[in-house]
Interface confidence: low
């Protein structure tokens, strides 16, 4: 996630307009206090996504923290978020207004807590006072959060001076609670459903016998209430569950489902939330792509993996040269598709001890009634190079002609070399490379053919030696990314009575 201009905080002039851009490789959105402010989102030409937050005619009320987050349809894998804080110094506004429930601060044990009185101007000096006493307390102040410290059960007030007037905040009430721990877990049968399917969410509490469940969910906003079912699961430890069931989901049922559990005897509570996304139609989308050409090595095993996201569960087919593939009884080919998270899948094609005939065009297709994707690539099988023959001929013009033929995939390179001192060759003396020499002592010609049926290259290299005046050891070496192979022949002058 990249925010432009970069933060982490901005101090804006009142009534000004300010534009913030957040970009990422996945869809993003801006949030402010869990609300989604008006913004424009777009996919850029380079495939990245941007969301633009335009703050127009700003006032002190725009002071606060803003988050750029991944669009929550992408699920928990992309939970990263970036925070910036904006101040709009506003002389007409003292402390930022608070919801009445935020004025009551409940502290469990002796833990650090925050009295969240905040001002619009980071330059203002703010002090904290016990309401009954007018002496400032020595507690650190964070302009973005408030006073942070350990507070007694008392009543507190914040003060600042704007211009020549003293401004007081609302009164904050701190209460200490003695509580026993409460363990709440929330889970959904599915966190992604299509409209018309059902949503079922369970909220389970362990080890507490008397609890109250309170649900908040998207339907509440429109006043349509869902009656949860409470389920007592006796045992050790005892478990009490509340089940929220919506038999026919609508698009508006997307959002956060929160289960708030309070223990009746001491008002201690805990809450857990889960996000559910209702989609109009199912989807299938690739999460990774493969290179156009994939390489396998002859007689080695090769696994090709495609990662995609889908709902509902798709069918997956693999094709080779437009023919459907299936697991082979001989175990030469293994297909598997596994569900690695609720909507994420990995489909694998494993070729065991790859054969040349397995080179070709492969396609994976994932599909269901609503959508489909496919991914294609060419599989190239690399074959070690072999020198198949090194032959010698003697035309009447006195030349010596050497012909070297070999095969391999990818295309082999040919190197000719010679060694004159037969006794020390080739271990004690480095061979001399041969080629089209300017002195016209040798002439080299190489032809390459690709054999479609064998899916490999054949190289035929012809070396013409104009005159040989003493015995030579000549080596033809073929080399490709899979290795090298060579053969040697000893060439003698025409006048000598022997040939090796």
């Amino acid at each position: 996630l990249v925010i432009t201009p970069p933060g982490p905080e901005f101090v804006l002039n009142i009534s000004s307009t300010f534009v913030l851009t957040c970009s990422s490789s996945a869809p993003v959105m801006w949030e402010q206090m869990s609300q989604v402010p008006w913004q424009e989102a777009a996919m850029n030409q380079d495939g990245t996504f941007s969301s633009v937050l335009t703050l127009t005619n700003v006032t002190g009320g725009d002071t606060g923290e803003y988050f750029c987050v991944y669009n929550n349809s992408l699920g928990p894998e992309l939970s990263e978020r970036k925070r910036i804080y904006i101040f709009v110094p506003d002389p007409t506004m003292g402390f930022l207004p608070m919801d009445s429930e935020d004025l009551f601060i409940f502290v469990t044990d002796v833990t650090e807590t925050t009295i969240p009185c905040r001002v619009t101007d980071p330059q203002l000096e703010v002090t904290l006072h016990e309401k009954k006493v007018d002496i400032p307390l020595h507690v650190p102040y964070d302009h973005q959060r408030g006073f942070i410290g350990t507070f007694e059960d008392k009543t507190y007030i914040c003060k600042t001076t704007i211009g020549d007037r003293e401004v007081d905040s609302d009164t904050y009430y701190v209460y200490s609670l003695q509580v026993s721990s409460i363990n709440v877990s929330v889970n959904a049968v599915q966190t992604v459903v299509r409209q018309g399917e059902s949503i079922t969410i369970r909220c389970i509490v362990m080890g507490n016998d008397v609890v109250n469940f309170q649900w908040t969910y998207p339907r509440m906003k429109s006043g349509r209430l869902v009656e949860p079912v409470t389920d007592y699961l006796f045992g050790v430890p005892s478990r009490i569950g509340s089940i929220l069931h919506i038999p026919t989901a609508e698009l508006s049922d997307s959002g956060t489902y929160t289960c708030n559990v309070s223990v009746s005897v001491n008002d201690h509570g805990d809450e857990k939330a889960i996000n559910v996304t209702v989609i109009e139609n199912g989807y299938v989308r690739l999460l990774e792509t493969l290179e156009d050409v994939q390489i396998a090595e002859l007689h080695r095993s090769r696994t090709l993996q495609v990662v995609f996201e889908a709902y509902p569960t798709p069918s997956v087919l693999w094709f080779k040269d437009n023919r459907t593939l299936g697991d082979s009884s001989a175990g030469e080919l293994v297909l598997s598709t596994r569900n690695v998270s609720e909507t994420r899948y990995v489909s694998e094609l494993t070729l065991v001890r790859v054969k040349v005939s397995e080179a070709g065009y492969y396609t994976m297709r994932a599909f269901h009634a609503d959508d489909q994707v496919q991914l294609s690539f060419k599989l190239q099988v690399n074959v070690p190079v072999r020198v198949l023959e090194l032959s010698e001929s003697h035309p009447a013009n006195g030349e010596q002609i050497l012909r070297c033929r070999g095969r391999g995939m990818p295309q082999p390179n040919v190197t000719w070399s010679t060694c004159r001192d037969l006794k020390r060759c080739p271990r004690k003396l480095s061979p001399t490379p041969l080629g089209n020499s300017s002195k016209e002592e040798s002439q080299l010609e190489t032809n390459v053919t690709f054999w479609e049926e064998d899916q490999e290259y054949e190289v035929v290299s012809t070396l013409r030696l104009r005159h040989v005046d003493q015995p030579l050891s000549v080596r033809c070496m073929l080399q490709n990314s899979m290795g090298r192979d060579s053969q040697e022949v000893t060439v003698v002058p025409h006048s000598l009575p022997f040939k090796v």
């Epitope: 869809p27 996919m43 030409q45 495939g47 989807y283 299938v284 989308r285 690739l286 792509t289 156009d292 297709r365 959508d371 489909q372 994707v373 496919q374 991914l375 294609s376 690539f377």
Partner: nanobody
């Protein structure tokens, strides 16, 4: 880089037919879907039809039965045959290419043509 060129637009009477062509060049291996969108003056761009590389087709409800999308793989061309045209079909028609997913939304398409004007008079 994928490039798209539309042709075949023009002025016709209500009830007539028209065939639009979209020639795709420089296709990358993961550009699977070619779609048609349209935009009338003062209105948002809307999805019309799309075709997957493997032949699956998708249509906007209001054009089903009247419009047919097809492709000629050899010519790398996608066609939109529009029959029984209505005045409300008047718009600039854009060809777009993308890699799939939500094929009925323009966020799925990364490459767009310049557009061809279709005007249906009553």
């Amino acid at each position: 880089e994928v490039q798209l060129v539309e042709s075949g637009g023009g002025l016709v009477q209500a009830g007539d037919s028209l065939r639009l062509s979209c020639t795709v060049s420089g296709r990358t291996f993961n550009t699977y879907v070619t779609g048609w969108f349209r935009q009338a003056p003062g209105k948002e761009r809307e999805f019309v039809a799309a075709i997957h590389q493997i032949g699956s087709t998708y249509y906007r409800n209001s054009v089903k039965g009247r419009f047919t999308i097809s492709r000629d793989g050899a010519k790398d061309t996608v066609y939109l045959q529009m029959n029984n045209l209505k005045p409300e079909d008047s718009a600039v028609y854009y060809c777009a290419a993308g890699n799939g997913g939500y094929v009925m939304s323009d966020i799925a398409y990364g490459t767009w043509g310049q557009g061809t004007q279709v005007t249906v008079s009553s």
